[in-house]
Protein backbone atom coordinates (compact mmCIF):
# COMPACT_ATOMS: atom_id res chain seq x y z
CA UNK A 1 0.00 0.00 0.00
CA UNK A 2 1.38 3.45 -0.89
CA UNK A 3 2.22 5.70 2.03
CA UNK A 4 2.81 9.41 2.49
CA UNK A 5 5.14 10.71 5.18
CA UNK A 6 5.26 14.25 6.53
CA UNK A 7 8.01 15.87 8.59
CA UNK A 8 7.78 19.37 10.04
CA UNK A 9 11.12 20.79 11.00
CA UNK A 10 12.05 23.89 12.94
CA UNK A 11 15.38 25.33 11.86
CA UNK A 12 17.94 25.36 14.67
CA UNK A 13 19.29 28.74 13.60
CA UNK A 14 15.93 30.51 13.31
CA UNK A 15 13.16 29.47 15.67
CA UNK A 16 10.57 31.13 13.45
CA UNK A 17 11.74 29.31 10.31
CA UNK A 18 10.01 26.05 9.44
CA UNK A 19 10.36 23.51 6.66
CA UNK A 20 7.83 20.86 5.73
CA UNK A 21 9.22 17.69 4.11
CA UNK A 22 6.90 15.19 2.43
CA UNK A 23 7.50 11.96 0.61
CA UNK A 24 5.64 9.25 -1.23
CA UNK A 25 6.43 5.60 -0.60
CA UNK A 26 4.91 3.62 -3.42
CA UNK A 27 5.55 2.16 -6.85
CA UNK A 28 3.66 4.67 -9.01
CA UNK A 29 4.88 7.82 -10.71
CA UNK A 30 3.87 11.09 -9.06
CA UNK A 31 1.75 13.44 -11.15
CA UNK A 32 1.13 16.21 -8.62
CA UNK A 33 1.86 17.19 -5.02
CA UNK A 34 -0.32 19.58 -3.07
CA UNK A 35 0.75 20.99 0.31
CA UNK A 36 -1.82 22.64 2.55
CA UNK A 37 -2.05 23.82 6.12
CA UNK A 38 -4.85 23.82 8.67
CA UNK A 39 -6.19 20.53 7.34
CA UNK A 40 -6.32 18.35 4.24
CA UNK A 41 -6.67 19.91 0.79
CA UNK A 42 -10.34 20.53 0.06
CA UNK A 43 -11.36 19.80 3.66
CA UNK A 44 -10.76 23.09 5.38
CA UNK A 45 -7.09 23.31 4.53
CA UNK A 46 -5.49 26.27 2.80
CA UNK A 47 -3.30 25.49 -0.18
CA UNK A 48 0.35 26.46 0.24
CA UNK A 49 1.98 24.93 -2.82
CA UNK A 50 1.37 22.77 -5.86
CA UNK A 51 4.31 20.94 -7.40
CA UNK A 52 4.17 19.23 -10.77
CA UNK A 53 7.11 17.05 -11.82
CA UNK A 54 7.30 18.62 -15.29
CA UNK A 55 5.25 21.81 -15.33
CA UNK A 56 6.81 23.44 -12.30
CA UNK A 57 5.79 24.90 -8.97
CA UNK A 58 3.20 27.35 -7.70
CA UNK A 59 3.08 28.59 -4.14
CA UNK A 60 1.26 31.04 -1.90
CA UNK A 61 2.20 32.91 1.26
CA UNK A 62 3.50 32.03 3.76
CA UNK A 63 5.34 29.56 1.52
CA UNK A 64 8.82 30.85 0.72
CA UNK A 65 10.28 28.09 -1.45
CA UNK A 66 8.74 24.86 -2.65
CA UNK A 67 11.00 22.38 -4.38
CA UNK A 68 11.51 18.76 -5.31
CA UNK A 69 14.14 16.99 -3.20
CA UNK A 70 13.93 13.65 -5.02
CA UNK A 71 11.54 12.20 -7.58
CA UNK A 72 9.24 11.20 -4.74
CA UNK A 73 9.79 13.86 -2.06
CA UNK A 74 9.41 17.61 -1.75
CA UNK A 75 10.26 20.34 0.73
CA UNK A 76 8.47 23.58 1.51
CA UNK A 77 10.23 26.37 3.37
CA UNK A 78 7.86 28.71 5.16
CA UNK A 79 8.16 32.45 5.48
CA UNK A 80 9.67 33.83 8.66
CA UNK A 81 6.81 35.86 10.09
CA UNK A 82 8.82 37.39 12.89
CA UNK A 83 6.89 35.53 15.59
CA UNK A 84 8.78 33.09 17.76
CA UNK A 85 7.02 29.90 16.60
CA UNK A 86 4.22 30.89 14.20
CA UNK A 87 3.65 27.38 12.86
CA UNK A 88 4.26 25.40 16.06
CA UNK A 89 0.66 24.19 16.46
CA UNK A 90 -0.25 24.06 12.79
CA UNK A 91 -1.09 20.92 10.86
CA UNK A 92 0.50 20.54 7.43
CA UNK A 93 -0.85 18.10 4.88
CA UNK A 94 0.69 16.68 1.73
CA UNK A 95 -1.34 15.04 -1.00
CA UNK A 96 0.43 13.00 -3.65
CA UNK A 97 -1.44 12.17 -6.82
CA UNK A 98 0.19 9.21 -8.48
CA UNK A 99 -0.50 6.92 -11.39
CA UNK A 100 -2.04 4.38 -11.16
CA UNK A 101 -2.59 4.45 -7.38
CA UNK A 102 -4.69 7.62 -7.12
CA UNK A 103 -4.33 10.28 -4.41
CA UNK A 104 -2.79 9.73 -1.01
CA UNK A 105 -2.66 12.33 1.71
CA UNK A 106 -1.06 12.53 5.13
CA UNK A 107 -0.74 15.30 7.69
CA UNK A 108 1.75 16.17 10.37
CA UNK A 109 2.80 18.93 12.72
CA UNK A 110 5.76 19.87 14.84
CA UNK A 111 5.73 17.82 18.07
CA UNK A 112 5.18 20.11 21.10
CA UNK A 113 8.42 18.93 22.70
CA UNK A 114 10.54 19.36 19.59
CA UNK A 115 13.96 20.85 20.00
CA UNK A 116 15.11 23.18 17.22
CA UNK A 117 16.50 21.14 14.38
CA UNK A 118 14.46 18.07 15.22
CA UNK A 119 11.46 16.97 13.24
CA UNK A 120 8.35 14.92 13.47
CA UNK A 121 8.84 11.19 12.97
CA UNK A 122 8.57 10.18 9.32
CA UNK A 123 5.38 8.21 9.72
CA UNK A 124 1.90 9.07 8.47
CA UNK A 125 -0.49 10.47 11.06
CA UNK A 126 -4.03 9.07 11.18
CA UNK A 127 -5.34 11.40 8.47
CA UNK A 128 -4.50 9.18 5.53
CA UNK A 129 -6.84 9.18 2.57
CA UNK A 130 -6.89 7.37 -0.71
CA UNK A 131 -9.17 9.10 -3.20
Amino acid sequence: TPEVWVQVQMEATELSSFTVHCGFLGPGSISLVTVSWGGPDGAGGTKLAVLHPELGTRQWAPARQARWETQSSISLALEDSGASSPFANTTFCCKFASFPEGSWESCGSLPPSSDPGLSAPPTPVPILRAD
Epitope: P53, L55, A61
Partner: antibody
Framework: QVQLQQSGAELVRPGASVTLSCKAS????????MHWVKQTPVHGLEWIGA????????AYNQKFKGKAILTADKSSSTAYMELRSLTSEDSAVYYC????????????????WGQGTTLTVSS | DIVMTQSQKFMSTSVGDRVSITCKAS??????VAWYQQKPGQSPKALIY???NRHTGVPDRFTGSGSGTDFTLTISNVQSEDLADYFC?????????FGAGTKLELK
Protein backbone atom coordinates in the same frame (compact mmCIF):
# COMPACT_ATOMS: atom_id res chain seq x y z
CA GLN B 1 -12.20 38.14 -26.29
CA VAL B 2 -9.80 38.23 -23.37
CA GLN B 3 -8.81 41.74 -22.30
CA LEU B 4 -6.73 43.06 -19.43
CA GLN B 5 -7.26 46.80 -19.21
CA GLN B 6 -4.72 48.59 -17.06
CA SER B 7 -5.01 52.04 -15.49
CA GLY B 8 -3.32 55.05 -17.05
CA ALA B 9 0.16 56.46 -16.63
CA GLU B 10 1.11 57.84 -13.21
CA LEU B 11 3.51 60.56 -12.15
CA VAL B 12 4.11 60.49 -8.41
CA ARG B 13 6.47 61.99 -5.87
CA PRO B 14 9.17 60.00 -4.07
CA GLY B 15 7.92 58.54 -0.80
CA ALA B 16 4.33 58.36 -1.96
CA SER B 17 2.23 55.29 -2.73
CA VAL B 18 0.27 54.42 -5.84
CA THR B 19 -2.29 51.78 -6.74
CA LEU B 20 -2.38 50.35 -10.25
CA SER B 21 -5.41 48.46 -11.51
CA CYS B 22 -6.04 45.72 -14.06
CA LYS B 23 -9.62 45.04 -15.13
CA ALA B 24 -10.21 41.63 -16.68
CA SER B 25 -12.92 40.82 -19.20
CA UNK B 26 -13.76 38.06 -21.65
CA UNK B 27 -13.12 35.19 -19.23
CA UNK B 28 -13.93 33.95 -15.74
CA UNK B 29 -11.73 36.09 -13.48
CA UNK B 30 -11.38 33.46 -10.75
CA UNK B 31 -10.14 30.76 -13.13
CA UNK B 32 -6.78 32.47 -13.58
CA UNK B 33 -4.15 33.83 -11.26
CA MET B 34 -3.14 37.42 -11.94
CA HIS B 35 0.57 38.13 -11.99
CA TRP B 36 2.42 41.44 -12.13
CA VAL B 37 5.64 42.08 -13.99
CA LYS B 38 7.95 45.10 -13.93
CA GLN B 39 9.93 46.19 -16.98
CA THR B 40 12.85 48.62 -17.07
CA PRO B 41 15.61 49.13 -19.65
CA VAL B 42 18.23 48.17 -17.04
CA HIS B 43 16.69 45.10 -15.43
CA GLY B 44 14.38 43.91 -18.19
CA LEU B 45 11.33 41.91 -17.12
CA GLU B 46 11.03 41.10 -13.42
CA TRP B 47 8.30 39.03 -11.84
CA ILE B 48 6.75 40.87 -8.87
CA GLY B 49 4.17 38.42 -7.63
CA ALA B 50 0.79 36.81 -8.11
CA UNK B 51 -2.66 36.63 -6.63
CA UNK B 52 -5.29 33.91 -6.90
CA UNK B 53 -8.54 35.91 -7.17
CA UNK B 54 -10.58 32.95 -5.98
CA UNK B 55 -8.83 32.54 -2.61
CA UNK B 56 -6.95 35.82 -2.25
CA UNK B 57 -3.75 33.80 -1.86
CA UNK B 58 -0.61 35.68 -2.84
CA ALA B 59 2.99 34.95 -3.76
CA TYR B 60 5.75 37.52 -3.96
CA ASN B 61 9.24 37.77 -5.31
CA GLN B 62 11.35 38.43 -2.19
CA LYS B 63 12.82 41.44 -3.98
CA PHE B 64 9.39 43.12 -3.98
CA LYS B 65 8.22 41.99 -0.54
CA GLY B 66 7.04 45.08 1.31
CA LYS B 67 7.17 47.15 -1.87
CA ALA B 68 4.15 45.67 -3.63
CA ILE B 69 0.81 44.58 -2.19
CA LEU B 70 -1.52 42.58 -4.42
CA THR B 71 -5.29 42.42 -4.02
CA ALA B 72 -8.22 41.40 -6.18
CA ASP B 73 -11.91 42.29 -6.26
CA LYS B 74 -14.00 39.42 -7.59
CA SER B 75 -17.13 41.55 -7.95
CA SER B 76 -15.49 43.91 -10.45
CA SER B 77 -13.00 41.37 -11.92
CA THR B 78 -10.20 43.76 -11.11
CA ALA B 79 -6.71 43.11 -9.74
CA TYR B 80 -4.78 45.81 -7.92
CA MET B 81 -1.15 46.40 -7.09
CA GLU B 82 -0.19 48.98 -4.49
CA LEU B 83 3.40 50.19 -4.61
CA ARG B 84 4.69 51.84 -1.44
CA SER B 85 7.51 54.19 -0.44
CA LEU B 86 8.25 55.00 -4.05
CA THR B 87 11.71 55.91 -5.28
CA SER B 88 13.13 56.57 -8.74
CA GLU B 89 14.03 52.86 -8.88
CA ASP B 90 10.32 52.12 -9.08
CA SER B 91 9.94 54.06 -12.32
CA ALA B 92 9.00 51.41 -14.86
CA VAL B 93 6.27 49.92 -17.00
CA TYR B 94 4.13 47.51 -14.97
CA TYR B 95 2.15 44.72 -16.61
CA CYS B 96 -0.59 42.47 -15.33
CA UNK B 97 -0.75 39.08 -16.98
CA UNK B 98 -2.94 36.06 -16.42
CA UNK B 99 -1.84 32.53 -15.64
CA UNK B 100 -4.15 29.55 -15.89
CA UNK B 101 -4.57 27.84 -12.53
CA UNK B 102 -5.39 24.32 -13.64
CA UNK B 103 -2.65 21.76 -14.13
CA UNK B 104 -5.05 19.41 -15.87
CA UNK B 105 -4.93 21.57 -19.00
CA UNK B 106 -1.11 21.69 -18.86
CA UNK B 107 -1.25 25.30 -20.01
CA UNK B 108 1.38 26.76 -17.74
CA UNK B 109 2.23 30.20 -19.06
CA UNK B 110 1.18 33.85 -19.28
CA UNK B 111 -1.16 33.83 -22.24
CA UNK B 112 -2.50 37.39 -22.18
CA TRP B 113 -0.99 40.65 -20.94
CA GLY B 114 -2.37 44.07 -20.16
CA GLN B 115 -1.15 47.05 -22.17
CA GLY B 116 1.07 48.19 -19.30
CA THR B 117 1.04 51.18 -16.96
CA THR B 118 3.95 53.59 -17.02
CA LEU B 119 4.92 54.79 -13.57
CA THR B 120 7.25 57.75 -13.22
CA VAL B 121 8.58 58.65 -9.79
CA SER B 122 9.99 62.14 -9.76
CA SER B 123 10.08 65.22 -7.58
CA ASP C 1 16.85 32.17 -7.94
CA ILE C 2 17.08 30.47 -11.32
CA VAL C 3 18.99 32.60 -13.83
CA MET C 4 17.89 32.51 -17.46
CA THR C 5 20.75 33.55 -19.72
CA GLN C 6 20.16 34.81 -23.23
CA SER C 7 23.74 35.27 -24.29
CA GLN C 8 22.98 37.12 -27.50
CA LYS C 9 21.60 40.60 -26.86
CA PHE C 10 21.24 41.27 -30.59
CA MET C 11 20.86 39.02 -33.62
CA SER C 12 21.00 40.25 -37.20
CA THR C 13 18.95 38.50 -39.83
CA SER C 14 17.41 38.97 -43.26
CA VAL C 15 13.87 38.35 -44.42
CA GLY C 16 13.56 34.69 -45.37
CA ASP C 17 16.39 33.57 -43.10
CA ARG C 18 16.22 30.99 -40.33
CA VAL C 19 17.34 32.20 -36.92
CA SER C 20 17.76 30.45 -33.56
CA ILE C 21 17.57 32.31 -30.25
CA THR C 22 18.91 30.47 -27.24
CA CYS C 23 18.22 30.56 -23.52
CA LYS C 24 20.15 28.70 -20.82
CA ALA C 25 18.80 27.99 -17.34
CA SER C 26 21.13 27.91 -14.34
CA UNK C 27 19.54 24.65 -13.22
CA UNK C 28 17.30 21.92 -14.59
CA UNK C 29 13.85 23.39 -15.27
CA UNK C 30 12.50 20.38 -17.19
CA UNK C 31 10.24 21.88 -19.88
CA UNK C 32 8.93 24.73 -17.72
CA VAL C 33 9.91 27.44 -20.17
CA ALA C 34 7.87 29.87 -22.26
CA TRP C 35 8.88 32.34 -24.98
CA TYR C 36 7.50 35.84 -25.53
CA GLN C 37 7.76 38.40 -28.31
CA GLN C 38 7.69 42.11 -27.59
CA LYS C 39 7.61 44.94 -30.12
CA PRO C 40 8.49 48.53 -29.16
CA GLY C 41 5.72 50.23 -27.18
CA GLN C 42 3.73 46.99 -26.91
CA SER C 43 3.20 44.40 -24.21
CA PRO C 44 4.76 40.94 -24.50
CA LYS C 45 2.89 38.35 -26.54
CA ALA C 46 2.95 34.62 -25.90
CA LEU C 47 4.66 32.48 -28.52
CA ILE C 48 5.64 29.15 -26.98
CA TYR C 49 4.71 27.40 -23.74
CA UNK C 50 6.16 24.31 -22.07
CA UNK C 51 9.25 24.62 -24.26
CA UNK C 52 7.71 23.46 -27.53
CA ASN C 53 3.97 24.21 -27.69
CA ARG C 54 2.75 27.07 -29.85
CA HIS C 55 0.30 29.54 -28.34
CA THR C 56 -3.00 29.88 -30.19
CA GLY C 57 -2.63 31.79 -33.44
CA VAL C 58 1.18 31.78 -33.51
CA PRO C 59 2.50 31.04 -37.03
CA ASP C 60 4.16 27.65 -37.45
CA ARG C 61 7.43 29.30 -38.47
CA PHE C 62 7.98 29.74 -34.71
CA THR C 63 9.29 26.57 -33.10
CA GLY C 64 10.44 25.95 -29.54
CA SER C 65 12.72 23.13 -28.44
CA GLY C 66 14.83 21.97 -25.54
CA SER C 67 14.50 20.67 -22.01
CA GLY C 68 16.56 20.70 -18.83
CA THR C 69 18.83 23.71 -19.13
CA ASP C 70 19.07 24.52 -22.84
CA PHE C 71 16.22 26.00 -24.84
CA THR C 72 15.91 27.35 -28.35
CA LEU C 73 13.36 29.47 -30.19
CA THR C 74 13.72 29.02 -33.94
CA ILE C 75 12.12 31.31 -36.49
CA SER C 76 12.22 29.87 -39.98
CA ASN C 77 11.54 32.12 -42.96
CA VAL C 78 11.85 35.33 -40.93
CA GLN C 79 9.31 38.01 -41.82
CA SER C 80 9.70 41.75 -41.29
CA GLU C 81 6.99 41.65 -38.60
CA ASP C 82 9.18 39.25 -36.61
CA LEU C 83 11.71 41.98 -35.83
CA ALA C 84 11.24 42.38 -32.10
CA ASP C 85 12.61 41.45 -28.68
CA TYR C 86 12.31 37.82 -27.59
CA PHE C 87 12.30 36.72 -23.94
CA CYS C 88 12.35 33.34 -22.28
CA UNK C 89 10.66 32.67 -18.94
CA UNK C 90 11.13 29.81 -16.47
CA UNK C 91 8.29 28.75 -14.21
CA UNK C 92 9.89 25.69 -12.64
CA UNK C 93 10.43 27.52 -9.35
CA UNK C 94 9.42 30.78 -7.74
CA UNK C 95 10.43 33.46 -8.23
CA UNK C 96 9.61 33.22 -11.91
CA UNK C 97 12.53 34.63 -13.89
CA PHE C 98 12.97 35.99 -17.40
CA GLY C 99 15.91 36.09 -19.73
CA ALA C 100 17.34 39.53 -20.53
CA GLY C 101 16.01 39.33 -24.07
CA THR C 102 17.37 39.04 -27.58
CA LYS C 103 16.65 41.78 -30.10
CA LEU C 104 16.12 40.53 -33.64
CA GLU C 105 17.10 43.18 -36.19
CA LEU C 106 17.70 43.44 -39.91
CA LYS C 107 21.24 43.10 -41.28
Amino acid sequence: QVQLQQSGAELVRPGASVTLSCKASGYTFTDYEMHWVKQTPVHGLEWIGAIDPETGGTAYNQKFKGKAILTADKSSSTAYMELRSLTSEDSAVYYCTRWITTVVATLYYFDYWGQGTTLTVSS
Amino acid sequence: DIVMTQSQKFMSTSVGDRVSITCKASQNVRTAVAWYQQKPGQSPKALIYLASNRHTGVPDRFTGSGSGTDFTLTISNVQSEDLADYFCLQHWNYPLTFGAGTKLELK
